[in-house]
Interface confidence: low
């Protein structure tokens, strides 16, 4: 379980995940969750890996904004918009990759501040 | 084997929720290589996606309906239920449960489906 | 969204010809093309998964092809239980999307 906090004090938020592996070839799920906001419009979800440019995933205004997504990504990712407002930021993952190992972070932005927290995920073959 | 069977009423009345429940046996609900998916087909046309999911209550909507559309789980009874509220005729359609694949996303098994007419 | 389009959207066969039926997507959707079989009355049944491999206990018959962009199932030659309607299915892509059918009807 890991738990960060924003940096510029009120104006943080808390943002918890926790680490999590997925079975190549399947879809997994990268578990993320935040202070909820009454507004959906004023939530900012970003999900970056590691080592990789663009990004993993953006939700914003109340969709999914991907035009920064980058292409080992491109349609194999998606927030669980109806549950982001309750402060549920996990990203469900398409296809699962040995590459999709790494680092991830989850990083929030709402009205009432901003947080992130990182992520540990690994792939392979679990029963 | 794994048989899915859908059921509910069959007539709904405009702007009122539509309510399914697919019930699963032969398998439990919580296999963790699956999630499970509704599918609706209007008379005499083709099939669209409604949403589905993961045994934990993880969903996923197409967007096109996410606003009306909620999918709930309950493990306990190996059930999975769909709601869709503010009905029009437009809803009208037969109503699939099915498997769906974690990755190929194939839908397989489907239950037999039931007919829901949005009518007064 | 991603938009399947079948063709063409009636096929009219003898039995025992060969059916191509075709399906073509907005964007490339790989590998990640399904096909099903309904008959009136029922559910649909899956054929094809991965664009060309057979679902158990389909015939080998039937047979799928295609990547990116375009799509064929081909049934060689037509049983009577074969005329139906045939739907495609990309899962590449949130939502997932079917194509608009194609009726495969006895000449």
């Known amino acids: 379980l890991i738990i960060g906090f924003g940096i510029s004090g009120r104006h943080s938020i808390t943002v918890t995940t926790v680490a999590s592996a997925g079975n190549i070839g399947e879809d997994g799920i990268l578990s993320c969750t935040f202070e909820p906001d009454i507004k959906l419009s004023d939530i900012v979800i970003q999900w970056l890996k590691e080592g990789v440019l663009g990004l993993v995933h953006e939700f914003k205004e109340g969709k999914d904004e991907l035009s920064e997504q980058d292409e080992m990504f491109r349609g194999r990712t998606a927030v669980f918009a109806d549950q982001v407002i309750v402060g549920n930021a996990s990203l469900r993952l398409k296809n699962v990759q040995l590459t999709d190992a790494g680092t991830y972070k989850c990083y929030i932005i709402t009205s009432k501040g901003k947080g992130n927290a990182n992520l540990e995920y690994k792939t392979g073959a679990f029963s | 084997q794994l048989q899915l069977q859908e059921s509910g009423p069959g007539l709904v009345k405009p702007s009122e929720t539509l309510s399914l429940t697919c019930t699963v046996s032969?398998?439990?609900?919580?296999?963790?290589?699956?999630?499970w998916g509704w599918i609706r087909q209007p008379p005499g046309k083709g099939l669209e996606w409604i949403g589905n999911?993961?045994?934990?209550?993880?969903?996923y909507y197409n967007p096109s309906l996410r606003s009306r559309v909620t999918i709930s789980v309950d493990t306990s009874k190996n059930q999975f239920s769909l709601k869709l509220s503010s009905v029009t005729a437009a809803d009208t359609a037969v109503y699939y449960c099915?498997?769906?694949?974690?990755?190929?996303?194939?839908?397989?098994?489907w239950g037999q489906g039931t007919l829901v007419t949005v009518s007064s | 969204e991603i938009v399947m389009t079948q063709s063409p959207a009636t096929l009219s066969v003898s039995p025992g010809e060969r059916a191509t039926l075709s399906c073509r997507a907005s964007q490339s959707v790989s590998s990640n093309l399904a096909w099903y079989q309904q008959k009136p009355g029922q559910a649909p049944r899956l054929l094809i998964y991965?664009?060309?491999t057979r679902a158990t206990g389909i015939p080998a018959r039937f047979s799928g092809s295609g990547s990116g962009t375009e799509f064929t199932l081909t049934i060689s030659s037509l049983q009577s239980e074969d005329f139906a309607v045939y739907y495609c299915?990309?899962?590449?892509?949130?939502?997932?999307?079917f194509g608009g059918g194609t009726k495969v009807e006895i000449k």
């Open positions: 032969g398998g439990s609900i919580k296999s963790g290589s699956y999630y």
């Open positions: 299915q990309q899962y590449h892509s949130f939502p997932f999307t």
């Open positions: 999911i993961y045994y934990s209550g993880s969903t």
């Open positions: 991965g664009a060309s």
């Open positions: 099915a498997r769906e694949g974690s990755y190929p996303n194939q839908f397989d098994p």
